[in-house]
Interface confidence: low
């Protein structure tokens, strides 16, 4: 997170830290005791699927305070439409090997109903993004969990206000822009997969996933987030279905 | 709708403006007051737009030049007071007033619903947690706010 602040311990209780072979991989969001939402691109280069760990209740990576809960990732489900190395359909649903125990420091973020997300949450201007990613473009990653308040843009406004880059990916209907184009604040590498959380009448909801951008906090560019509302039914259907074998699964979308 | 104007100076008004066409200046002479002249002139020059009683559901009408304004009773709204305010209680309008989820129903009022781990209160719009750790709440902040002294 560039230009954010430390999320006080326990105030981002749905934040997940994903590790592979003990190394920091990505962020994620707990949506109930056994399921985590993250970004598909986080898993493009994974070879040791059985060494994926999700950590809940984490705050400061440099110390163990007893509130952390680690779980093996039993399954990573990615939409069939996602192509590794690209930006569209950048979402993954992770099944934990064992459920986490909900505590003051481990709480799920609500996965909203689609219509509510599209016609109400999408019009809440500011939302929080969080993670242990880089504090500057090409800089060091954070030890303490960072959080940033970002305004959401309509895609048309995002395109109009963004500097044109030749090979820049399209902003599709499965994404949205949020943040600042003045180079001051943005999510960054290492935050990928983490939550874009929107507050409405006392409750927080998952509205986006940290996905991609032109560098981090680059002048003339906004952060791009996976539009979770497009995947609500897909996620719910998968969470209801019988477990399928295999760590990495491609599930038909839509 | 504007009969009160005719009570002001019946003789002059009949003579100058009803029997033959009068000008704004002649009307001004009759009423001696700019505001009253204007009210009369709006109705006189382009007809009384309130004559057809366009305001429904007990609304009162005010004539305007080529137009009119309805003043509605509290339960109604719309150009002609034709819409019952409850009919505007639909999900696209401020989430239908619901705290969480909203469902529209044809012929009946919208209904509010709550996420798993919450239940709907008697007011029909608010949600209250039914589990210790409902989604989307931050326990540390909830407890901090609950322990704050309450104003009296």
């Amino acid at each position: 997170i560039v230009g954010g602040k430390v999320c006080p311990k326990g105030e981002c209780p749905w934040q997940v830290l994903l590790l592979v072979n003990g190394a920091q991989l990505c962020g994620g969001t707990l949506i109930n005791t056994i399921w985590v939402v993250s970004a598909a691109h986080c898993f493009d280069k994974i070879k040791n699927w059985r060494n994926l760990i999700a950590v809940l209740g984490e705050h400061d990576l440099s110390e163990h305070d007893g509130d952390e809960q680690s779980r093996r990732v039993a399954q990573v489900i990615i939409p069939s439409t996602y192509v590794p190395g690209t930006t569209n359909h950048d979402i993954a649903l992770l099944r934990l090997h064992q459920p986490v125990v909900l505590t003051d420091h481990v709480v799920p973020l609500c996965l909203p109903e689609r219509t509510f997300s599209e016609r109400t949450l999408a019009f809440v201007r500011f939302s929080l993004v969080s993670g242990w990613g880089q504090l500057l473009d090409r800089g060091a990653t954070a030890l303490e969990l960072m959080v940033l308040n970002v305004p959401r843009l309509m895609t048309q406004d995002c395109l109009q206000q963004s500097r044109k880059v030749g090979d820049s990916p399209n902003i599709t209907e499965y994404m949205f822009c949020a943040g600042y184009s003045d180079g001051s604040k943005d999510s960054c590498k290492g935050d990928s997969g983490g939550p874009h959380a929107t507050h409405y009448r006392g409750t927080w909801y998952l509205t986006g996933i940290v996905s991609w951008g032109q560098g981090c906090a680059t002048v003339g560019h906004f952060g791009v987030y996976t539009r979770v509302s497009q995947y609500i039914e897909w996620l719910q259907k998968l969470m209801r279905s019988e477990p399928r074998p295999g760590v990495l699964l491609r599930a038909p979308f839509p | 709708a504007n009969a009160f104007l005719e009570e002001l100076r019946p003789g002059s008004l009949e003579r100058e403006c009803k029997e033959e066409q009068c000008s704004f200046e002649e009307a001004r002479e009759i009423f001696k007051d700019a505001e009253r002249t204007k009210l009369f002139w709006i109705s006189y020059s382009d007809g009384d737009q309130c004559a057809s009683s366009p305001c429904q559901n007990g609304g009162s009408c005010k004539d305007q030049l080529q137009s009119y304004i309805c003043f509605c009773l509290p339960a109604f709204e719309g150009r002609n007071c034709e819409t019952h305010k409850d009919d505007q209680l639909i999900c696209v309008n401020e989430n239908g007033g619901c705290e969480q989820y909203c469902s529209d129903h044809t012929g009946t009022k919208r209904s509010c619903r709550c996420h798993e781990g919450y239940s709907l209160l008697a007011d029909g719009v608010s949600c209250t947690p039914t589990v210790e750790y409902p989604c989307g709440k931050i326990p540390i902040l909830e407890k901090r706010n609950a322990s704050k002294p309450q104003g009296r």
């Epitope: 699927w49 059985r50 990615i78 069939s80 399928r244 074998p245 295999g246 760590v247 990495l248 699964l249 491609r250 599930a251 038909p252 979308f253 | -």
Partner: antibody, heavy 122, light 107 residues
Framework: QVQLQESGPGLVKPSQTLSLTCTVS?????????WSWIRQPPGKGLEWIGY???????NYNPSLKSRVTISVDTSKNQFSLKLSSVTAADTAVYYC???????????????WGQGTSVTVSS | EIVLTQSPATLSLSPGERATLSCRAS??????LHWYQQKPGQAPRLLIK???QPATGIPARFSGSGSGTDFTLTISSLEPEDFAVYYC?????????FGQGTKLEIK
């Protein structure tokens, strides 16, 4: 390089149990993947019999389910097929196979044994 | 179960020609369709996975397309070694099923 090799009797009497073993080399059977059995009657198409996943879970073709058992012996890096109450209709070339572990659930079969011919006859 | 119907049953072409093989699913299977080539006395070989992704080591003349219920395997310019039987496979839901095959023979 992953290699699979089927072994077992080439002739089985009707009503008996057909038993085949697949030995996997160049890859640990317990590390991932679905390990399948597929058969092909003479001059006909391919029929999926079932698989065992590295975790031990199995999935069988409903048309054969009542007669099929697939098991794994991780110590020998082998998995086996047992098909009971065989008839002449079970005469086929039997292939053992490993599904491509690109994304696990679609069972694109990237590795095959060379096949073993089994005839059911008295 | 998902039934895959391949057409034509037999396709007679000459080397250098373009071959187009069709596979139709009885219900939508997204892109969960794979293509195999089988030569006499040999095990099948995976050509295309997920409708359009070439398997490792497959020549560029083989390509796949389609999604949902209609799928096509195209061989842009036939080589002598391409004459074989081609099968499509449903990888979408159990039981896993194969098409009945298309035999590609030399004209």
């Amino acid at each position: 390089q992953v290699q699979l090799q089927e072994s077992g009797p080439g002739l089985v009497k009707p009503s008996q149990t057909l038993s085949l073993t697949c030995t996997v080399s160049g890859y640990s059977i317990s590390s991932d993947s679905a390990w399948s059995w597929i058969r092909q009657p003479p001059g006909k198409g391919l029929e999926w019999i079932g698989y065992i996943y590295y975790s031990g879970s199995t999935n069988y073709n409903p048309s054969l389910k009542s007669r099929v058992t697939i098991s794994v012996d991780t110590s020998k890096n082998q998995f086996s097929l047992k098909l009971s109450s065989v008839t002449a209709a079970d005469t086929a070339v039997y292939y053992c196979a490993r599904s491509v572990n690109y994304y696990g659930n679609s069972f694109a079969v990237g590795y095959w044994g060379q096949g073993t011919s089994v005839t059911v006859s008295s | 179960e998902i039934v895959l119907t391949q057409s034509p049953a037999t396709l007679s072409l000459s080397p250098g020609e373009r071959a187009t093989l069709s596979c139709r699913a009885s219900q939508g299977i997204s892109d969960y369709l794979h293509w195999y080539q089988q030569k006499p006395g040999q095990a099948p070989r995976l050509l295309i996975k997920y409708a359009s992704q070439p398997a490792t080591g497959i020549p560029a003349r083989f390509s796949g397309s389609g999604s949902g219920t209609d799928f096509t395997l195209t061989i842009s310019s036939l080589e002598p070694e391409d004459f074989a039987v081609y099968y499509c496979q449903n990888g979408h839901s159990f039981p896993l099923t194969f098409g009945q095959g298309t035999k590609l023979e030399i004209k």
